[in-house]
């Protein structure tokens, strides 16, 4: 009966050697792909000289296989019923799933110029930077290959800076041969309703990036949730990519390869301004760019990125306020393509399919003392790329799941 199934499920979703959950948790059996679309700037000179709207044209997908490496340093702690681990990063380019090669060129914002002018706001330092920008023949925009843009390149301007700075720049640099964590999560042995919920991240229960409740590490890493998920639940999870915890709400029932799953989506409310969603007050970290915390749909994660002015949003500024996208031409947000969803099998709490979508933007501001930014009349949150990370349970695994889990219940 139901009790027996519940008992079996509770046993099999515990994160310890010998369970179905553990095997799939250590190394995902699902192929995960990360597709990138790069925003190629069409009018760099007009923007730099006249502060025109930035005309972008997305190019992609450029696809990489990710999350294929097993978790490392997996250590059980019997005392507090947790398991700790590192999640290694790796990306392999998939030419057959891409529109071009890693050598394709793109005109994008000069990451180093935008970041340095933001980090060093002292006018004297900006004048020093200006002379180095000019000397290195750098400008507001640059042409970079996909490989350089994503994984790193030696910046000619930063290479001239006479004090210690990292001279390699890339949106995901460093990535290969690095790991995310240490994560310490509850293994569920003593309390199955806590399974996979993060206890600490990098040894702390808070992030130190935000004020108040915004700084909390809530829920799981979204790969799974405690079993017996209800449609009424708000599923909390932490995403290190966006340096914050977020949540998903039930949207619809979906049939995935014969398995009934619940589709949970990130609601627009999660991206709302504190005016609309007061809970979000602590994600508003400054008053100028956010227009006194009335702008919405972009998240300033500079504190999490060594002061670099990185803003995270949904692709094409989906769910963002008009003032954010107004200076950018060529964006076409739509929910179907650009929102994030998780398809969760409710009995086990396993995420059997997901699409995580986000956009990486960089703030660039006018600067009196930096020639290449001198003619700007306004701030721009410049889209650099958006990504779609997807994973779907394989046919074989789906069959196994149907026979061992959902089939037994039905």
């Amino acid at each position: 009966g139901d009790l027996l199934i519940q008992k079996t499920i509770k046993k099999q979703v515990v994160l310890e050697e010998g369970t179905i959950a553990f095997k799939n948790w250590v190394k995902t059996g699902t192929e995960v792909y990360r597709q990138f679309w790069i925003f190629d700037v069409q009018n760099p000179q007009e923007v730099m000289m006249n502060s025109s709207n930035i005309q972008v044209k997305q190019r992609g997908p450029y696809t990489y296989r990710v999350r294929f490496l097993a978790k490392e340093n997996v250590t059980q702690d019997a005392e507090d019923n947790t398991v700790s681990f590192l999640q290694p990063n790796g990306a392999i380019f998939e030419p057959s799933l891409s529109v071009g090669t890693e050598a394709d060129n793109f005109t994008v914002l000069n990451l180093a110029v935008a970041a340095a002018s933001h980090i060093y706001q002292n006018q004297f330092v900006q004048m020093i930077l200006n002379s180095l920008i000019n000397k290195s023949k750098s400008s507001m925009f640059q042409v970079r290959t996909l490989r350089e843009l994503l994984w790193g390149y030696r910046d000619p301007f930063l290479s001239l800076v006479p004090y210690p700075v990292t001279t390699t720049v890339g949106l995901f640099y460093p990535y290969n041969n690095t790991a995310d964590g240490v994560y310490k999560v509850f293994n569920g042995k003593d309390n199955i309703s806590k399974v996979a919920i993060i206890d600490t991240y990098k040894g702390k229960r808070n992030l130190s990036y935000w004020e108040s409740h915004c700084d909390m590490i809530n829920g799981t890493d979204a790969a799974s949730f405690p079993p017996f998920v209800e449609k009424s639940q708000v599923l909390q999870f932490f995403s290190s990519d966006i340096c914050r915890s977020i949540y998903a709400v039930f949207e619809s029932d979906v049939n995935l390869k014969g398995i009934p799953v619940y589709r949970f989506v990130l609601p627009s409310k999660a991206f709302a301004s504190p005016v609309e969603n007061p809970d979000n007050y602590c994600f508003c970290t400054e008053k100028i760019i956010s227009k006194n915390c009335t702008s919405y749909g972009v998240l300033d994660i500079s504190k999490c990125k060594e002061g670099r002015p990185v803003y995270i949003s949904l692709p094409h500024f989906l769910y963002a306020s008009p003032d954010v996208s107004e200076p950018i031409d060529g964006l076409n947000p739509n929910e179907e393509e650009h929102r994030t969803y998780l398809d969760i099998e409710p009995i086990t709490g396993f995420t059997l399919q997901f699409a995580k979508r986000l956009q990486v933007n960089l703030l660039v501001k006018p600067s009196e003392k930096i020639q290449v930014l001198k003619n700007l009349k306004r701030n721009y949150i410049v889209p650099i790329l958006w990504l779609n990370e997807t994973g779907t349970i394989g046919d074989e695994k789906a069959n196994m799941f149907r026979s061992q889990v959902t089939g037994k219940i039905n």
Partner: antibody
Framework: EVQLQQSGPELVKPGASVKISCETS????????MHWVKQSHGKSLEWIGG????????KYNQKFKGKATLTVDKSSSTAYMELRSLTSEDSAVYYC???????????WGQGTLVTVSA | ETTVTQSPASLSMAIGEKVTIRCITS??????MNWYQQKPGEPPKLLIS???TLRPGVPSRFSSSGYGTDFVFTIENLLSEDVADYYC?????????FGGGTKLEIK
């Protein structure tokens, strides 16, 4: 109140070196650029260079490269300028001057007279 | 390097008169010009900063104008306490450069 207190007058021999100090108070030392300015007797002002204590970034007027070295001691909120291989041409009043946000040379020290004489 | 040519080198004016000092730069510096007053035995004092901005506490008889390469500093209704040397400073680029100075005396 922001104050810049410079060290006293110096009488030095040709070929020698001298190190002038500028002790600051009443502000966050690391956040503002400290400049040094030369004024020869009866002449105009010349910018020697500046230092941003926060990260040690310095920039010199080409004319004073090799002549002046700017340093800071954050623990005592003091800026220093060392002048080397002194000649009579280096006899002058030297000022330290501090910026205020986006305002150049908003605060000045009282000046240090350096006299180079055999 | 931007050179700054200041004129006149000296001038003698009567109390109550209007004083005009000019600085011309060798490159376009937008409105990045500053003006300083130096009285004998004292360090210079900032009167007007970039963008022709009168500093707090500075009397309104002092003003400046100009953009690009041509800049003018004005004292309306000269007072005896205005006897000093006056310097302009361009702050558009490094090295920062001063004008040669103007010695103002009372007739």
């Amino acid at each position: 109140e922001v104050q810049l207190q410079q060290s006293g007058p110096e009488l030095v021999k040709p070929g020698a070196s001298v190190k002038i100090s500028c002790e600051t108070s009443g502000h966050t030392f690391t956040e503002y650029t400290m400049h040094w300015v030369k004024q020869s007797h009866g002449k105009s002002l010349e910018w020697i260079g500046g230092i941003y204590p926060n990260n040690g970034a310095t920039k010199y007027n080409q004319k004073f490269k090799g002549k002046a070295t700017l340093t800071v001691d954050k623990s005592s909120s003091t800026a220093y300028m060392e002048l080397r291989s002194l000649t009579s041409e280096d006899s002058a009043v030297y000022y330290c001057a501090r910026d205020r946000y986006d305002v150049w040379f908003a605060y000045w020290g009282q000046g240090t007279l350096v006299t180079v004489s055999a | 390097e931007t050179t700054v040519t200041q004129s006149p080198a000296s001038l003698s004016m009567a109390i109550g008169e209007k004083v005009t000092i000019r600085c011309i730069t060798s490159t376009d510096i937008d409105d990045d010009m500053n003006w300083y007053q130096q009285k004998p035995g004292e360090p210079p004092k900032l009167l007007i900063s970039e963008g022709n901005t009168l500093r707090p506490g500075v009397p309104s008889r002092f003003s400046s104008s100009g953009y690009g390469t041509d800049f003018v500093f004005t004292i309306e209704n000269l007072l005896s306490e205005d006897v000093a040397d006056y310097y302009c400073l361009q702050s558009d680029n490094l090295p920062l450069t001063f004008g040669g100075g103007t010695k103002l005396e009372i007739k």
